[in-house]
């Protein structure tokens, strides 16, 4: 088999026939050096999954539940291409599983016990697996058989396809539990009708069900959605209030050597020639000899899944939690109201050591998880491997796009009411050596630049955003002659000045000596022409305040700031000479952990915060000898956000817009993956 062949896995005679037709028609339109199709027939989707893992086939299209199976060891498959529905302009690759209730019913998600429930059908995704999976640990024991536990949880249900003899309560609202449209409460529309008729108190359906059944907005306004955080939202706010976001139908391949680019090339060309309304003789999204053969008949085309996206991220934390609960059936010993330990994400060895020290001192309240980059940490928080970390505003933006929420803000000024008063922010500045007297904001081209890291606020988003507005392109590595911007591509001129050794060169963590505020300033001191840092960086590292050999003899007076009007000013005049105001660093977490992270961190800062006077004899949370480990070293306290509890509200409209403009220059693979899930 030539290397450019994609071996498609078919699960029935009809699929195999369509696959052969697909193969033959592709041959007729694609040059001989292009991708081609071969067909492999297996007895089931699980056999296809195993065949792909064993390198006997390359691709198959799966429903969400099977994507989960495909991801589990030893299969280790990943999503590579998604089918989309709707229009090319507004492609839908996911649907949302929701819990719909009547507006005046007054209960929340955590008060469903004893209510009457309407389900699309036993074993179906939105109607059963997701809601029951998420409620699993609230079900009365024994939880097996599951139907019995569910019957004892709700006071009555309609769960079409259930066994009405063994579990009559599941058929109480729809006598007989018929498994077809003959049952008026079967399927999405049926489950909604069950709610509408007043038979049930809650209907588990998908987000589009209510729109398909109620054309009139006034009618829709009589209903609400139950959110996982025990609030309610209007039915059109399903993106912010759902049980899970579920991919509709996805092509999977091996994680390693999986031919994902070839599969995309093949399917992209296939949709060009044989997609919706393209060809009479062969149609990719049509099944004359059956239904949904190889691809869903309702699909309109394909989208490439971003490479950073593994199955866990693609399926989402809620969906994975629900399915894992159902499959593994494990719950914590009697659930308590007490918070579990918060798993803090630490970057590289330096942060991990400080985190471990915190963990020991916290007496079991904090545990530590390691990752190599900030984006890896954010991904771990998203999928539940970690719970929280403190982030620069640029990463608060990425975390927010990935569904995380800010929970507390670092405050840098001493005040009587520190914890209750989140600050307006700090200043992003451009620092130069006083001796380079001809250097201004207007003649930085060809100079050597020092950045905290790619994607961070003061070191990248603000200066590069301003620069982009001037030069109208993203080739910043051509604008500066060389520099150190940790997180840049290793062969970029923006890694040339960096000092990390071997694989650590230009890495966006403390293994790179020029990483972060202190690192970028050190880069200026030793090699660079300009450093993009925060307004406190120079005073914090001069006048003997940083004892490291490179810094101990530095004098603040030897440095100046570049102002946007082309002038220069002394370092202490940052309030009148800065690039922009930056939002303070903030702690982020998943929505489901928000309350516990808030509670535990408030306790921890009372024990180890800036009220500790002697850091040589005690653990201090906000100290790490100018290395900004876990938190910025100038943090005075972690402050409540009050109503600024989403990333947009926290960062502010101006900053969100500025980062949004820079998106076209973004190299963030995580941001690309998260905007695929939520454009």
């Amino acid at each position: 088999v030539p290397d450019k062949t994609v071996r498609w896995c078919a699960v029935s005679e009809h699929e195999a026939t369509k696959c052969q037709s697909f193969r033959d028609h592709m041959k007729s339109v694609i040059p001989s050096d292009g991708p081609s199709v071969a067909c492999v027939k297996k007895a089931s989707y699980l056999d296809c999954i195993r065949a792909i893992a064993a390198n006997e086939a390359d691709a198959v299209t799966l429903d969400a539940g099977l994507v989960y199976d495909a991801y589990l060891a030893p299969n280790n498959l990943k999503p590579v291409v998604a089918e989309f529905y709707g229009s090319k302009e507004d492609p839908q690759t996911f649907y949302y599983a929701v819990a719909v209730v009547k507006k005046d019913s007054g209960f929340q998600m955590n008060q469903l016990r004893g209510k009457k429930s309407c389900h699309t059908g036993l074993g179906r995704s939105a109607g059963w697996n997701i809601p029951i999976g998420l409620l699993y640990c609230d079900l009365p024991e024994p939880r097996k058989p599951l139907e019995k536990a569910v019957a004892n949880f709700f006071s009555g249900s309609c769960a079409p396809c259930a066994d009405g003899t063994d579990f009559p309560q599941l058929c109480q609202l729809c006598p007989g539990c018929g498994c077809s449209t003959l049952n008026q409460y079967f399927g999405y529309s049926g489950a909604f009708k069950c709610l509408k008729d007043g038979a049930g108190d809650v209907a588990f359906v998908k987000h589009s069900t209510i729109f398909e059944n109620l054309a009139n907005k006034a009618d829709r306004d009589q209903y609400e959605l139950l959110c996982l955080d025990n609030t309610r939202k209007p039915v059109d706010e399903y993106k912010d209030c759902h049980l899970a976001q579920v991919p509709s139908h996805t092509v999977v391949a091996r994680s390693m050597g999986g031919k994902e680019d070839l599969i995309w090339e093949l399917l992209n060309q296939a949709q060009e020639h044989f997609g919706k309304d393209k060809s009479k003789e062969f149609q990719l999204f049509s099944s004359p000899h059956g239904k949904d053969l190889l691809f869903k008949d309702s699909a309109h085309g394909f989208l490439k899944v971003p490479p950073r996206m593994d199955a866990k991220m693609y399926l989402g934390y809620e969906y994975v939690t629900a399915i894992r609960n159902l499959r593994e059936g494990t719950c914590p010993e009697a659930p308590t109201d007490e918070c579990k330990p918060v798993k803090w994400c630490a970057l590289s060895h330096h942060e991990r050591l400080k985190c471990d020290e915190w963990s020991v001192n916290s007496v079991g309240k904090i545990e530590c998880v390691s990752a190599e980059t900030t984006e890896d940490c954010i991904a771990k928080i998203m999928n539940g491997e970690a719970d929280a970390m403190s982030l620069d505003g640029g990463f608060v933006y990425i975390a927010g796009k990935c569904g995380l929420v800010p929970v507390l803000a670092e405050n840098y000024n001493k005040s009587d009411n520190c914890e209750d008063t989140p600050e307006a922010g700090y200043f992003a500045i451009a620092v130069v050596k006083k001796s380079a007297s001809d250097l201004t904001w207007d003649n930085l081209k060809g100079k050597k630049s020092c950045h905290t890291a790619v994607g961070r606020t003061a070191g990248w988003n603000i200066p590069m955003g301003l620069l982009y507005n001037k030069i109208n392109h993203c080739r910043f590595d051509e604008f500066f002659s060389e520099g150190c911007a940790p997180g840049s591509k290793k062969d970029s001129s923006l890694c040339k000045l960096c000092m990390g050794s071997g694989l650590n060169l230009c890495e966006p963590n403390n293994k790179e000596g020029y990483y972060g505020y202190t690192g970028a300033f050190r880069c200026l001191v030793e090699k660079g022409d300009v450093a993009f840092v925060k307004h406190q960086t120079v005073p914090q590292n001069t006048g003997g305040k940083n004892p490291d050999p490179w810094a101990k003899n530095l004098n603040e007076k030897d440095y100046e700031l570049l102002c946007l009007d082309g002038t220069r000013k002394p370092v202490e005049e940052y309030a009148n000479c800065h690039l922009a105001r930056a939002p303070n660093h903030a702690v982020v977490t998943r929505k489901d952990k928000e309350a516990c992270v808030h509670k535990i961190l408030r306790q921890q800062q009372h024990l180890f915060g800036s009220n500790v006077t002697d850091c040589s004899g005690n653990f201090c949370l906000f100290r790490s000898e100018t290395k900004d480990l876990l938190f910025r070293d100038d943090t005075v306290c972690l402050a409540k956000l009050h109503d600024r509890n989403t990333y947009e509200k926290y960062l502010g409209e101006e900053y969100v817009k500025a980062v949004g403009n820079l998106r076209k220059c973004s190299t963030s693979s995580l941001l690309e993956a998260c905007t695929f899930r939520r454009p």
């Epitope: 471990d356 963990s359 020991v360 001192n361 007496v363 079991g364």
Partner: nanobody
């Protein structure tokens, strides 16, 4: 009240070894983990190694591969085995567990 007593320090040539011990009086010692710190003259106290109740260990970068921390809960003791000692390892070594004040420490001097 639990007290910590460190011992095992001394004068040793570069490349040599020492085994420090930290013994606790009282019960419940190290239930949340034990940390060895050191302080060189005129410098900040720095973390050297730690061991948690589940046996997890971690070390500062400069001692990794040379030092090993271990514990024996039955003996209420934590050890720090130090091999391939370097002059930069000189200082007073202290062990610490949450809620218990620092002890006197034990002096380690490595001559070149």
């Amino acid at each position: 009240q639990v007290q910590l007593v460190e011992s095992g320090g001394g004068l040793v040539q570069a490349g040599g070894s020492l085994r420090l011990s930290c013994v606790a009086s009282g019960s419940g010692f190290g239930i949340n983990g034990v940390i060895w710190y050191r302080q060189a003259p005129g410098k900040q106290r720095e973390l050297v190694a730690l061991i948690k109740s589940d046996g997890y260990t971690n070390y500062r970068e400069s001692v990794k591969g040379r030092f090993t921390i271990s514990r024996d809960d039955a003996k209420n003791t934590v050890w720090l085995q130090m091999n391939a000692l370097e002059p930069e390892d000189t200082g007073v070594y202290y062990c610490k567990t949450p809620g218990v004040p620092f002890g006197q420490g034990t002096q380690v001097t490595v001559s070149s």
